[in-house]
């Protein structure tokens, strides 16, 4: 798998999308996990609804949300109030039994808020020692959900 880079601004929301073959992964729940080291395990952050038919319902774990368009074949992860420590390597996964197939490897980069003049020295970027060959960069611009805004699924 190639690695897709998603860049977001500190303090804002970042939306990560993972497209997949909707028939190949029919009936399978999905998950978002964080890679612990280059060869380490992928630690589950959040997974879609326990009932696959309700995968369109957004599920949260802390500041991370997941929702799955099972017909269109797009898994969407929202990282709210992005922080420097959110930067790193993640995976979108398709679950079957106790196993997981990787749908996409994702490198999250956190950019300094241009309106925030505090020291940006602690913001994370991949160092030269870390190689992500053939990485594809996607700039994601998103907004935070307004207070009280309920993320209903599309009706059509």
């Amino acid at each position: 798998h190639n690695t897709t880079v998603f860049q977001g601004v500190a303090g804002q929301s970042l939306q990560v999308s993972c497209p997949y073959d909707s028939m190949k992964h029919w009936g399978r729940r999905k998950a978002w996990c964080r890679q612990l080291g280059e060869k380490g395990p992928c630690q589950r952050v959040v997974s879609t609804h326990n009932l696959w038919l309700l995968s369109f319902l957004r599920r949260w774990n802390g500041s991370t949300a997941i929702t799955d368009d099972t017909l269109g074949g797009t898994l969407t992860i929202t990282l709210r109030n992005l922080q420097p420590h959110d930067a790193g390597l993640y995976q979108c996964q398709s679950l079957h039994g106790s196993e997981a197939d990787t749908l996409r490897k994702v490198l999250v980069e956190v950019l300094a808020d241009p309106l925030d003049h505090r020291d940006a020295g602690d913001l994370w970027f991949p160092g030269e020692s870390e190689s992500f060959e053939d990485a594809h960069v996607e700039h994601s611009i998103s907004r935070s959900l307004l207070e009280g805004e309920i993320p209903f699924p599309p009706t059509s």
Epitope: D21, M23, K24, W26, G27, L51, L53, H96, S98, E99
Partner: antibody, heavy 123, light 107 residues
């Protein structure tokens, strides 16, 4: 009606090559994984591997990896199991089966089976 | 690989009897288990999936239970057509593995 129709019985000599087939009908062939299962005479069932005809993604059992090749031609809704050099120990009944994912539990089960292809390898 | 062990390997029973076959996994497989019936010279047939869900068209006298490592297939009242060999299979992980089979014979 979902149907998997396998090719006929084969008698081969050790060292010969062979390709058996499994044709699916009555459903969208490219939307389901197809598995192959071996049953040696008087024995149990052994899962060999599986293929997703939509993109030919394939998984093998470690016991069969390198021993057989699983392929598919989606244009004719057919999956294949092949050997490049048969051994006497390959004598068995071979079944293809559709793997259907059950959305209740996100795993898949063999819900439709071919009638089996008997392969006999003898000098 | 996950090992699946069935017991007994064979059982003799009469029409109308209640029969229970057990299957044990070498490690926890949640409820990712199937039961199949196979008659001589025929392909296996799916009876139960997800440990306890009855496949469409299968008579209600068949039922499955269990989770984790221990599972059972129960036939509440044996019919003549039920005499066959039964296999369990784990759908937890690759490689998929089957039990060695339980042959159900007429007493």
């Amino acid at each position: 009606e979902v149907q998997l129709v396998q090719s006929g019985a084969e008698v081969k000599k050790p060292g010969e090559s062979l390709k058996i087939s499994c044709k699916g009908s009555g459903y969208s062939f490219t939307s389901y994984w197809i598995g192959w299962v071996r049953q040696m005479p008087g024995k149990g069932l052994e899962w060999m591997g599986t293929i997703y005809p939509g993109d030919s993604d394939t998984r093998y059992s470690p016991s069969f990896q390198g021993q057989v090749t699983i392929s598919a031609d989606k244009s004719i809704s057919t999956a294949y199991l092949q050997w490049s050099s048969l051994k006497a120990s390959d004598t068995a009944m071979y079944f293809c089966a559709r793997q259907r994912t059950m959305y209740y539990d996100s795993s898949d089960y063999f819900d439709a089976w071919g009638q089996g292809t008997l392969v006999t390898v003898s000098s | 690989d996950i090992q699946m062990t069935q017991s007994p390997s064979s059982v003799s029973a009469s029409v109308g009897d209640r029969v229970t076959i057990t299957c044990r996994a070498s490690q926890g497989i949640s409820s990712w288990l199937a039961w199949y019936q196979q008659k001589p010279g025929k392909a296996p047939k799916l009876l139960i999936y997800a440990a306890s869900s009855l496949q469409r068209g299968v008579p209600s006298r068949f039922s499955g239970s269990g989770s984790g490592t221990d599972f059972t297939l129960t036939i509440s009242s044996l019919q003549p057509e039920d005499f066959a060999t039964y296999f369990c299979q784990q759908a937890d992980s690759y490689p998929r593995t089957f039990g060695q089979g339980t042959k159900l014979e007429i007493k």
